[in-house]
Structure formats: structure tokens, C-alpha cells
């Protein structure tokens, strides 16, 4: 199984995302839109606007998800879209709350095996490649709600039913309580709360901060793992360089993570993944001779 794959890569064992954080409200700037003698004003934010075809994409992804996952075919995708829309339409995009998303959370309720959860920070693509091969493990984006919103941006305007395709609040420059940030905070918290037994997290060893307290993982998920359910958090530090044989589990930010986790009465372990390409190959073909012997 996975242990053999780790062994074969000489992975060191040590016992022991979506980006957000900071709180300030921005007012944005007002710019005229439309033509004619009476100007109509639209809020101008610092971030990119709502993804084009946003309503169509969310609805299509929902139906596609239920096609891919027959166990979710009871979901009414029109109701899901209505609840999603209701969370941010006609609301000030700097004043969104977790409460706004509760109807959507309720409709998107899904049971994933609580001991098969893979969290990630700043290394989404590899995490998704891994769960594509290791089909019994799940990232947040493998759940309905994560799948719906992955890589999308959205926001509305106070008191109008319009979606803002021009600009949306930037988390740093404008405000943290924007529709996208609050969505990911809400679903990430719920996902972490659901986890049990051994929880895995994939971290990017090429970043200056391998563990970043300001990432969604560092600011939300770490603090919402339930010590009464979660026995161990196991970090997989993914190396970027071909010849990088350093033990990144000794990195100060990993030690910081270990300290936070230990204080929460959860055990911590860490593994280096020196060759992510080989790691994935061995997950695909564990019987391969190079995956069962030391290399």
C-alpha cells in the first residue's frame, strides 16, 4: 500500500490553498457604467470580476457531479444554484457571512469517509492528481460544493439582482468577508470538522513558508480538526527540485505546525516526498518493482 510507496522513495518519517486572511473593509471606488444622460454607478473592486458563464458553469458542474457520482443523484441542481445565488446576490460583497451560505451547505450535505481526507496548501494540482489515482481519498474539491466552486470567482452588488462581471473584492486590498473567501472558509471549516483518524495534508516544499498560517489550511482547517476524532495529522512535504535531498520536515514552519497541532492534542507526523512524479507513478502501479524496494 502507501507505506511501501513511501519506503521505496526513502521518505523520511518524523513523529512528533485557497489564500485568505486579514480583516479590513474596503469601500471600493465608484465608476459610471452604461450610457445615456443618467449615469448608473457600479462598485469597482481590486480583484477580477465574476467568472464568465458563472451561473451556467455552476449548474452544469452540479449536474455533471451527479452524473459522475450516482450516490448524489438525489441532489436538485436547480435548488443548489438558487441557494448559491441567494448567498451573494443583492448583498454587499464585503458583508457576506457564513450564515448566508447555510442553505447551500444544507443542500450540499455529503458524507465522505472521514478517515480518507486529504487537505492541501499551495499544491492543489498534485493533490488532485493523487486523489484521481487513489480513488478512496478525497480533497475538498472532490466533494460537490468544492467541485462547484473550484477556480471560480463571483460577487454581486448591494440592492441589485445583478452579478458583477467587472470586478470583485480582493481579499487583501478590499475586504476579507467577500463571497468567495467566505465560501471557502465555510466549506473548509466543515470539511476539517468532518475529518477523523489520520488526516493527511499535502504541503508545497518549494514555498518559502511550507506551512503558512495565513493559508486556508493554516487559518481554518488546522483549527477545526476535532481532537476527539482526529488521532494524527500527517504532513506530506512535496519537494520541487530534482536533486533536493534536504529533510524539509525539519523546516521551521513545519515545526510551527507541529507545535500548533500538538497543543491541540493531535499527534503529528511528517514525510518528505522527494520525487512527486515517482510517488504518483507508484500510487498508480504499486506492484512496480521500483516501488517495493529501497531506491
Amino acid at each position: 500500500g502507501l507505506n511501501d510507496i513511501f519506503e521505496a522513495q526513502k521518505i523520511e518519517w518524523h513523529e512528533g490553498s485557497h489564500h485568505h486572511h486579514h480583516h479590513h473593509h474596503g469601500s471600493g471606488s465608484l465608476v459610471p457604467r452604461g450610457s445615456g444622460s443618467v449615469p448608473r454607478w457600479r462598485q469597482q473592486w481590486s480583484g477580477p470580476g465574476t467568472t464568465k458563464r458563472f451561473p451556467e458553469t455552476v449548474l452544469a458542474r452540479c449536474v455533471k457531479y451527479t452524473e459522475i457520482h450516482p450516490e448524489m443523484r438525489h441532489v436538485d441542481c436547480q435548488s443548489v444554484w438558487d441557494a448559491f445565488k441567494g448567498a451573494f446576490i443583492s448583498k454587499h460583497p464585503c458583508n457576506i457571512t457564513e450564515e448566508d451560505y447555510q442553505p447551500l451547505m444544507k443542500l450540499g450535505t455529503q458524507t465522505v469517509p472521514c478517515n480518507k481526507i486529504l487537505l492541501w496548501s499551495r499544491i492543489k494540482d498534485l493533490a488532485h492528481q493523487f486523489t484521481q489515482v487513489q480513488r478512496d481519498m478525497f480533497t475538498l474539491e472532490d466533494t460537490l460544493l468544492g467541485y462547484l466552486a473550484d477556480d471560480l470567482t463571483w460577487c454581486g452588488e448591494f440592492n441589485t439582482s445583478k452579478i458583477n462581471y467587472q470586478s470583485c473584492p480582493d481579499w487583501r486590498k478590499d475586504c476579507s468577508n467577500n463571497p468567495v473567501s467566505v465560501f471557502w472558509k465555510t466549506v473548509s471549516r466543515r470539511f476539517a470538522e468532518a475529518a477523523c483518524d489520520v488526516v493527511h495534508v499535502m504541503l508545497n516544499g518549494s514555498r518559502s513558508k511550507i506551512f503558512d498560517k495565513n493559508s486556508t489550511f493554516g487559518s481554518v482547517e488546522v483549527h477545526n480538526l476535532q481532537p476527539e476524532k482526529v488521532q494524527t495529522l500527517e504532513a506530506w512535504v512535496i519537494h520541487g527540485g530534482r536533486e533536493d535531498s534536504r529533510d524539509l520536515c525539519q523546516d521551521p514552519t513545519i515545526k510551527e505546525l507541529e507545535s500548533i497541532i500538538s497543543k491541540r492534542n493531535i499527534q503529528f507526523s511528517c514525510k518528505n516526498i522527494y520525487r512527486p512524479d515517482k510517488f504518483l507513478q507508484c500510487v498508480k502501479n504499486p506492484e512496480d518493482s521500483s516501488c517495493t524496494s529501497e531506491i
Epitope: 458553469t57 452544469a60 458542474r61 455533471k64 452524473e67 459522475i68 450516482p70 484521481q132
Partner: antibody, heavy 120, light 107 residues
Framework: EVQLQQSGPEVGRPGSSVKISCKAS????????MHWVKQSPGQGLEWIGW????????DYAEKFKKKATLTADTSSSTAYIQLSSLASEDTATYFC?????????????WGQGTLVTVSS | DIQMTQSPASLSASLGETVTIECRAS??????LAWYQQKPGNSPQLLIY???SLADGVPSRFSASGSGTQFSLKINSLRSEDVASYFC?????????FGAGTKLELK
């Protein structure tokens, strides 16, 4: 109008590989998963697998896991199936197919089929 | 995997006659069943989805019923253009599976 246009017939030698294409038009390619179905001469239909073009995610029937590889190119709205290590039992017509989202999950749209003949 | 058993394998009928084809699933598939018609040299065409709903453009002489494990397709007032093979398919679970088909010929 939704159309799935498949590439022409292929002849492959035993042990070699072939790659068939299915070009989609009349809809947003990433909004639907694409299925592939095999029909051996004079035989029934066998589901091979699906691909989600938006993410490149795939799923295969156990029987086809080592035989077929599904890929998609969103820039050209084209799905592909590659058949490897060809053997006589791979001689068949291969179809791409898509649901309509309004017709349950039955396949409302089909490509015209591509005949693959394995011959030495 | 869910097995789909279709009967009869072939059948001859006269114009104007009513024809029934049966399909049995090896486990409960609720109403997650489609019926297809395939004429020689053509792709299959969706006739029925969700066990009993008629697909767009399909003549009303085609009807279907059933749920759970027992399903049937009925063709009223058989016409010459109905000569084809008919397949049932379950889409309740992956892998999707098809019946072996029924070849319908004219007497």
C-alpha cells in the same frame, strides 16, 4: 445543434496503439462528461469509461483500465481514446456519447462510431 | 457489476403487431434505465430514459414501463422502420452496463 464527429476508420497491427478522436460542437465542451462505448462486430454494447474534460478526470470499467486511455483537449473541444497493445478482440466500433442532462443519464447524443480493425 | 438480461434475443413480428421486449437487472436500479434503438451501420438512438420517459422526437407508439429490476419496452402498431436492434442500459451505478440486445425482424 449538438454534434459528435469521430475520426475515420483505423487499422492497427497487433501490439500497436491507435488514437481515435471525437470533436464536439453545438455546446460548451466542459459542461458535460464524455463517455466511450465499444461495440464488437455483431455484438452488444460495452461501456468503456468517461472523462470530465474540464478537469481531465476519468473513470474506467475494470476491463478497460489497462487497455484504454481517455484524454480531452478543451481548446479544440475534442475527446480522445487511445487503445494500447492491440489484439484481435479490440476489433470493434468505438463510439463517444454524451447525456443531455434533461434525459436522465441516458446517452442522448452519439458520435457516428469509428471502426478499429486489428490485423497483421 | 450489474448484469442486464434482455429477452428475447431475437424476434419476428408482423406489421401492425404489438411487440414487447423485457429487460431484467441483477439488482435494484430504481428507474435508472434507458432503451436504445440501433439500425445496421448507425449509432444507437435514445428512445426511453428514466425507465418510462420518451426521448425527444420518438414516436408515441413506443412506450416503456418498470422499476426496480423488471423493465419492458413496448412497440405498438409495428412499422417497417422499427426493424432494428434494441438495447436496455442501466445508469444507476458505474460501470454502466447494457443488455445483450434484441434483434427485431419482420415476419
Amino acid at each position: 445543434e449538438v454534434q459528435l464527429q469521430q475520426s475515420g476508420p483505423e487499422v492497427g497491427r497487433p501490439g500497436s496503439s491507435v488514437k481515435i478522436s471525437c470533436k464536439a460542437s453545438g455546446y460548451t465542451f466542459t459542461d458535460y462528461i464524455m463517455h466511450w462505448v465499444k461495440q464488437s462486430p455483431g455484438q452488444g454494447l460495452e461501456w468503456i469509461g468517461w472523462i470530465d474534460p474540464e478537469y481531465g478526470r476519468t473513470d474506467y470499467a475494470e476491463k478497460f483500465k489497462k487497455k484504454a486511455t481517455l484524454t480531452a483537449d478543451t481548446s479544440s473541444s475534442t475527446a480522445y481514446i487511445q487503445l494500447s497493445s492491440l489484439a484481435s478482440e479490440d476489433t470493434a466500433t468505438y463510439f463517444c456519447a454524451r447525456s443531455a442532462h434533461t434525459t436522465g443519464f441516458g446517452f442522448a447524443y452519439w458520435g457516428q462510431g469509428t471502426l478499429v480493425t486489428v490485423s497483421s | 457489476d450489474i448484469q442486464m438480461t434482455q429477452s428475447p434475443a431475437s424476434l419476428s413480428a408482423s406489421l401492425g403487431e404489438t411487440v414487447t421486449i423485457e429487460c431484467r437487472a441483477s439488482e435494484d436500479i430504481y428507474s435508472n434505465l434507458a432503451w436504445y434503438q440501433q439500425k445496421p451501420g448507425n449509432s444507437p438512438q435514445l428512445l426511453i430514459y428514466d425507465a418510462n420517459s420518451l426521448a425527444d422526437g420518438v414516436p408515441s407508439r413506443f412506450s416503456a414501463s418498470g422499476s426496480g429490476t423488471q423493465f419492458s419496452l413496448k412497440i405498438n402498431s409495428l412499422r417497417s422502420e422499427d426493424v432494428a436492434s434494441y438495447f436496455c442500459q442501466q445508469y444507476n451505478n458505474y460501470p454502466y452496463t447494457f443488455g445483450a440486445g434484441t434483434k427485431l425482424e419482420l415476419k
